[in-house]
C-alpha cells in the first residue's frame, strides 16, 4: 500500500508511518514501528506536557518565587503547569504572573481615577481635554490646564494630554 | 544590593507622636514618586501617604489625614512619615515603597506598636 502523507488526529507521520502521539502529561519514548506501538512515560513530579505530543522532554513547572512576591495560586500536575499569583495586596505585573507589584503607575497622558486597594490595582483614566499629568504616578489625577485668562496672559503654546498650556503676555495694539 | 531600609519604629503611647525615616541603599530617590503602606496585624496592606517626584503633591489615607505628614529630602535620599496623635490602630508594620514598587525593592519595615 502506498505509504500514508497526512495522518489522523492524534497522530504524527515519522518514516512513512502514522504514530500515536503521546497523551498529555507523557513524553515519548520512542517512535512506533511496523510492530510496535508508540512507547510514551509519565512526565516527572515537577514536570508536565498540556498537549498530545511527541516531545521528549516534559517542560518544568513554573517556580513562584517568593523573592519577587510570588507564591502558588494552584499547584502543577503532570498535565498542566503551576499558577503563581501574588502575596496578598500585591499585583501581577502581566497575565503570565512572572512578577509583583505593590501598584502599577499611571503614565504620562493618565491619571489615577483610583487609588490602589489590597484587592484592586491602580486604575488609570486618559486626561481629557483640558486636562494633564506629566508623571508617572499611583495618586495624582490630571491637572487642570492653567487658565491664562485669569493671570491676563494669552495662551502661547497650547496644552495636551500630557503639557499645561504655556501663557505668554499680550501683544498691545500699538495706536 | 538595592533595597529601602525603614527605621524609627517603636512603642510609643496613644496620642503619641513618632517619626519614621526610610534610606535607599543602592538607588536614588530624586524625582521618583514614594509611598509608606503598612501592614496591622493580621489585615492586609493599607496605602498610608504619598509624595510626589517634585514633593510638590501629596496623598494621604483618610484613616491617617491631618496626623500624619510624609516629606522627603533627596540630597540624603530619605522619606520621612512624622505621625501625631497615634492611635491603636496604627499599630502596624511600615514599610516605603519606590515606584516602580516591585517586590524586590521591599524592606524589613520598621514596627510601630501604639499600646498604653
Known amino acids: 500500500p502506498e505509504p500514508p502523507t497526512a495522518c489522523r488526529e492524534k497522530q504524527y507521520l515519522i518514516n512513512s508511518q502514522c504514530c500515536s502521539l503521546c497523551q498529555p502529561g507523557q513524553k515519548l519514548v520512542s517512535d512506533c514501528t511496523e510492530f510496535t506501538e508508540t512507547e510514551c512515560l509519565p512526565c516527572g513530579e515537577s514536570e508536565f506536557l498540556d498537549t498530545w505530543n511527541r516531545e521528549t522532554h516534559c517542560h518544568q513547572h513554573k517556580y513562584c518565587d517568593p523573592n519577587l512576591g510570588l507564591r502558588v495560586q494552584q499547584k502543577g500536575t503532570s498535565e498542566t503547569d503551576t499558577i503563581c499569583t501574588c502575596e496578598e495586596g500585591w499585583h501581577c505585573t502581566s497575565e503570565a504572573c512572572e512578577s509583583c507589584v505593590l501598584h502599577r503607575s499611571c503614565s504620562p497622558g493618565f491619571g489615577v481615577k483610583q487609588i490602589a486597594t489590597g484587592v484592586s490595582d491602580t486604575i488609570c483614566e486618559p486626561c481629557p481635554v483640558g486636562f494633564f499629568s506629566n508623571v508617572s504616578s499611583a495618586f495624582e489625577k490630571c491637572h487642570p490646564w492653567t487658565s491664562c485668562e485669569t493671570k491676563d496672559l494669552v495662551v502661547q503654546q497650547a496644552g495636551t494630554n500630557k503639557t499645561d498650556v504655556v501663557c505668554g503676555p499680550q501683544d498691545r495694539l500699538r495706536a | 544590593e538595592v533595597q529601602l531600609l525603614e527605621s524609627g519604629g517603636g512603642l510609643v503611647q496613644p496620642g503619641g507622636s513618632l517619626r519614621l525615616s526610610c534610606a535607599a541603599s543602592?538607588?536614588?530617590?530624586?524625582?521618583?514618586e514614594m509611598w509608606w503602606v503598612r501592614r496591622a496585624p493580621g489585615k492586609g496592606l493599607e496605602r498610608v501617604a504619598?509624595?510626589?517626584?517634585?514633593?510638590?503633591?501629596?496623598y494621604y489615607a483618610d484613616s491617617v489625614k491631618g496626623r500624619f505628614t510624609i516629606s522627603r529630602d533627596d540630597s540624603k535620599n530619605t522619606l520621612y512619615l512624622q505621625m501625631n496623635s497615634l492611635r491603636a490602630e496604627d499599630t502596624a508594620v511600615y514599610y516605603c515603597?519606590?515606584?516602580?514598587?516591585?517586590?524586590?525593592?521591599w524592606g524589613q519595615g520598621t514596627l510601630v506598636t501604639v499600646s498604653s
Open positions: 515603597a519606590r515606584d516602580p514598587y516591585s517586590f524586590d525593592y
Open positions: 504619598a509624595i510626589s517626584g517634585s514633593g510638590g503633591s501629596t
Open positions: 543602592g538607588l536614588t530617590f530624586a524625582g521618583y
